[in-house]
Structures are given as C-alpha cells and as structure tokens.
C-alpha cells in the first residue's frame, strides 16, 4: 500500500514547537511525500513559492539517502494559488505548453520524482482543459524518459465533494493518465451548514439529510470508482487536523446550532481548524464522543466543538480502504500531526504511524 503524506511549506512559520521543516520527517514514515506548494511564474513556468523553497527541497530530498525507496513529489497550486490562474494556463495552448515543458526539468533539477496537481478546483468550463493538462503532462513525462532516468510520477489532488467532482472532473479520462489520485476525503462539513458536523465521516450518519448522504468517505470513494477511477489508483485522504465550531447554545451534540468557526489554535492560528497536537491539548477536560455510524470522534469543551481523527478512527478508515482494494492512504498533513510527541511523550506522528501500521 502507498502512504502518501503532504508537507506544507508554510508550516515553518508557525511559532515555537509548531514550526516544522522537512528534516523533521521520519524517512521511513511514508512511501511518498508531497511538498506543497509550488507556484507558476508569470511566464508560465513551474517555480518556487517560498524564499527558502530550494533549501527545503534539498532537506526533503535528502531523506532519500536514508530511505532509497522513498518518492517525493512537488504539488503545484493550492488555495492561495487559486483556480483562476490555473484556468488561464490550462485553457491557452501556448501557456499550457510552456508550463508542461517546464515541469520535468524543474523536478529533475531539485531531485523530485513527480508532480502533484492541486487545482482547487476546476470549474465546468475548465473540465476539458484539466483533462488536457493531465494528458499532456503524462505525455511529456513519457517522452522525457531516458536510460538512467525513470518516468516522473503524476498525481492530482481531487475534491471528494460530489458537486466539485461533477463540475470539474472527467474522472474516466484523467484517471488513465495519473499514477495515483489523492482524494481529499475531508472538509465535507463546514460552517456554511450552521450546525455541528464531522468533516470526514467514514459513513453516512443516521440523522443525515438527503444532501448529506454524499458527504462521507464511503460515498466519495464508491462514486469515484463508479465514474471510472481504478481502485488501484485511489488514495483515501485522512486528515490529521480537526474542524472546529463555536456553539450557539448549550446544545453540543451532532447537529447542534453553531454561531461560527471554532477558536484558532495556539500554533496554527486559523479559525475553525486545529492540528492534532492542538486537539490533544483541547481534549484535557473535554467531553469526548464517538459517532458509531460515522466511525469518527468529536469533542466538546465549553462553547467549542471539534470533529477530528484519532488512532481508532484512522485504523477503521484503513480497514475500509483495504476492503475496497484502494491503493492506500493520503495524509494531510505531516505538520498537523503530533510531530513533536507532545500528546504522548516520545510518540511522534501518532496518527500517521497508526495509518502506517494498519496498512502493513
């Protein structure tokens, strides 16, 4: 099984023990590590994003001297990059060709084994351009193989939301040109629903409405397969972060009304999102519940509510992906797991390690 783990370059800016650099990654933890994110320059070439990306690329790829089987990929795009710029590049032959031709030399120069596309998210008019972009990247990667130089890997991070899938992806077409698909089976539930809910339930909940039946890992995986994605190329996304809400009343169960996103974490400083190492802290004195249908936990403390993953829930998810004969798991993100071993002393990356152990 593959265990594909994302590293985020901005995690270096978190304060104190929250700061994370690639050399903190255990070399044998994951089979593939994806560095997020690279940029695309004004002349449509793959390029660095952070001032010290080159140094961090080097730190990441040095892990391969210890684990020679480790593969590294560079992810291009992301939320800040936006879908508009991707659309401008993919929809124009000249721009798209310039980008496609720039990718392999860039990856080779910095020691990466492949590219991950994080176009978040293609709109209806971009659907065919996204397919074309993937097809052309794969063709370029095939063409540039030479003895002593293996073919570069190509993956894509795809939304697990039904609307986004139907709108932006021709699954049958893109799946044949990708080595694997990173299915983002999280962020299913958010503040827009105005009630509490887990953002990555394995199965549909008993109380779920008609729309909610799409908002779970099981549905997304089965739907992708139905649309033509080979199970052997699908990686099920498992989050090491939780989604939090501020409760609107004393009601604190699943489906309780909310007034907004949860308070920002001490280190991640983003309302509505908590790293696992922040959740550990939150759990002290909190009320913990396990959703029997959804197979995931949530916790409440005061007016704060958080849906998250623990060792038990990730093991359940791995059991599911094995049953469905998927390619493996994807983790977002290493820097949001307890990489310092603060939850339980000397236990580093507990969630990712639990996934690794369950995959074995």
């Amino acid at each position: 099984y593959k265990l594909v783990c994302y590293f985020t370059s901005w995690s270096q800016y978190r304060e104190g023990v929250g700061s994370f650099l690639p050399d903190a990654i255990q070399p044998f933890l994951c089979t593939h590590i994806i560095y997020s994110f690279a940029n695309i320059s004004s002349d449509n070439m793959l390029s660095t994003w952070e001032w010290n990306d080159e140094s961090n690329y080097d730190k990441l790829n040095k892990l391969k001297t210890r684990n020679t089987n480790l593969k590294t990929l560079l992810s291009v795009g992301g939320w800040k990059f936006g879908e508009k710029r991707f659309s401008e590049i993919a929809s124009n032959t000249e721009r798209r060709t310039a980008f496609v031709r720039s990718v392999a030399p860039f990856l080779r120069s910095y020691g990466f084994d492949g590219l991950d596309l994080a176009w978040l998210y293609p709109r209806l008019r971009d659907k065919q351009y996204f397919s074309t972009l993937i097809k052309e990247l794969n063709a370029e990667f095939t063409k540039e193989v030479q003895p002593g130089r293996e073919k570069l890997l190509l993956s894509a991070a795809l939304s697990a939301g039904k609307v986004a899938i139907d709108t932006g992806y021709d699954i049958a077409q893109i799946a044949q040109h990708l080595d694997f698909i990173n299915l983002m089976t999280y962020d299913f539930h958010g503040v827009w629903r105005q009630i509490t809910g887990h953002h990555s339930p394995l199965f549909q909940g008993q109380k779920d409405t008609r729309f909610d039946r799409y908002s779970n890992v099981n549905y997304a995986v089965q739907y992708m397969i139905r649309l033509g994605a080979q199970a052997s190329k699908l990686l099920m996304g498992i989050p090491t972060f939780g989604k939090s809400f501020t409760l609107a009343s004393s009601e604190n169960q699943l489906g309780a009304p909310i007034s907004g996103e949860g308070l920002p974490g001490r280190f991640t400083k983003e309302a509505g999102t908590l790293a696992y190492y922040e959740i550990c802290d939150f759990l002290k004195g909190a009320e913990v519940h396990r959703l029997s249908n959804e197979k995931v936990p949530f916790a409440t403390k005061g007016n704060q509510w958080v849906g998250y993953e623990d060792k038990e829930s990730v093991k359940n998810k791995v059991g599911f992906l094995k049953e469905k004969k998927l390619a493996g798991a994807m983790v977002w993100a290493l820097d949001l797991d307890d990489f310092q071993g603060t939850c339980q002393p000397k236990e580093f990356f507990p969630l990712t390690n639990a996934i690794k152990d369950a995959l074995a």
């Epitope: 080779r108 120069s109 020691g111 002593g148």
Partner: antibody, heavy 125, light 110 residues
Framework: EVQLVESGGGLVQPGGSLRLSCAAS?????????MCWVRQAPGKGLEWIGC?????????YYADSVKGRFTISKHNSKNTLYLQMTSLRAEDTAVYYC????????????????WGQGTLVTVSS | DIQMTQSPSSLSASVGDRVTITCQAS??????LNWYQQKPGKAPKLLIY???SLASGVPSRFSGSGFGTDFTLTISSLQPEDFATYYC????????????FGGGTKVEIK
C-alpha cells in the same frame, strides 16, 4: 591514462561511406555511460551528432541532420565506439570528436567530461 | 527540440577584465546547462556543468549561474590563457535534439 582516441577519418567522395572508430583506454566503457559523437566544420561551432547508451547498446539518439545516414554502435570487448557514416555530403566535412558522458543524474544532468582529439573527415570530389 | 542561443558571438577584452557570456534555451532546461572552452586545434574542455558546478581543475575565476532558460558564464578576471571560444550546451535531454550546443563566443584580445 584515461583517454579516447578517434581514427578512420580521411577523404571520401560525396555519396560515399566511412566508419570512424573511438578507442577507449584507461577505463572500461561502463553500463552507465553514454558515448557520443560531436563534429565541428572548419571555422564553425560544435554540432552534436548523436549518442548511444552503453548499458543497453540499443538506446541511440541522433540529430535530425544525420538521422537515417549515420549509425552509432559499440564493441564491448574491444572497448570501442563506432560511427558508420553513409550517403556523405560536402556539409559533413568536419573534425569528428568522440565524447564520454558519465550518464544521467538529477544532480548533474548530461555533460561531456572526456573528449578525444578528433579525426578529420573531408567529403569532396 | 531545444535550441540554444549564445551571445555575443565574439567580444574583445583585456587581461583583468570581467567577462560575461549569456546563453538562452528555447524552453526550460532546469539547471542543466554546461560550458566548454575550446582553443584552436584542440578538443573542447568542460568548464562548468549543471549551471554552476565547476569541473575538476578549473580555476575559480570561472563561474556559472542561471535556471530555466537564461544562463550566464562569468570570468571574473580574464587571464591570458582564457582567450578562446566558449560554448554552452544543454545537458537536459538527448531526445528530439537537433544540436544542443550554442553557436559559441570567441573571446579575443582587445
């Protein structure tokens, strides 16, 4: 001493054929190497002709200007590289160099670290 | 097909001068750009590989930089033995390649 020595050059008529040899000494043409031919017309710049990947002996790459006319091959036991040239033209007149590329690595790419002294081929009637 | 364009084609300079030669690739080649020095009647000699790595035995007055499509060879203080012709070469691919070398830059005594 590690060196490459070309031979086989000379005067040939247009339409004729010639086989150049490149003998490697001081090292064995190992499986990771690419062995290549580069030429230089009198008073002109360097022009890449083609390469062979020694590891397979079947992976060959040629410039469009010589494709179908020139063939690169190797003889393992003789530690020798060959350039078979057919349908020669006046514009093929040049000094022909044999060069060694140690093989691809992301760290360094392709480059010619070792060159022969060159052999002159003159195509004229 | 990757084309290499070198400029200038020739330049005149004096001993002690700082000399800069540029090379442009028709498409991105990452860091894979090499520089060679050639003297009359001699085979080319590798100076720099992978854009900025100095070949063995090459004096430190030679340096290279660049990434993608634009590259530079700099001789910080020209010495009498540096008067020669310099060639850039893309070191990225042998596939679908027409030449791979730039046209050359002849460095002459002013």
């Amino acid at each position: 001493e590690v060196q490459l020595v070309e031979s086989g050059g000379g005067l040939v008529q247009p339409g004729g054929s010639l086989r150049l040899s490149c003998a490697a000494s001081g090292f064995t043409i190992s499986s990771d190497y690419y062995m290549c031919w580069v030429r230089q017309a009198p008073g002109k710049g360097l022009e890449w002709i083609g390469c062979i990947y020694i590891g397979s002996g079947t992976d060959t790459y040629y410039a469009d200007s010589v494709k179908g006319r020139f063939t690169i091959s190797k003889h393992n036991s003789k530690n020798t590289l060959y350039l078979q040239m057919t349908s020669l033209r006046a514009e093929d007149t040049a000094v022909y160099y044999c060069a060694r590329d140690k093989g691809w690595s992301n760290a360094w790419g392709f480059y010619f670290q070792l060159w022969g002294q060159g052999t002159l081929v003159t195509v004229s009637s | 097909d990757i084309q290499m364009t070198q400029s200038p084609s020739s330049l005149s300079a004096s001993v002690g001068d700082r000399v800069t030669i540029t090379c442009q690739a028709s498409q991105s080649i990452g860091k894979y750009l090499n520089w060679y020095q050639q003297k009359p009647g001699k085979a080319p000699k590798l100076l720099i590989y992978s854009s900025s790595s100095l070949a063995s035995g090459v004096p430190s007055r030679f340096s290279g930089s660049g990434f993608g499509t634009d590259f530079t060879l700099t001789i910080s203080s020209l010495q009498p033995e540096d008067f020669a012709t310099y060639y850039c070469q893309q070191g990225y691919s042998y596939v679908d390649l027409e030449n791979g070398f730039g046209g050359g830059t002849k460095v002459e005594i002013k």
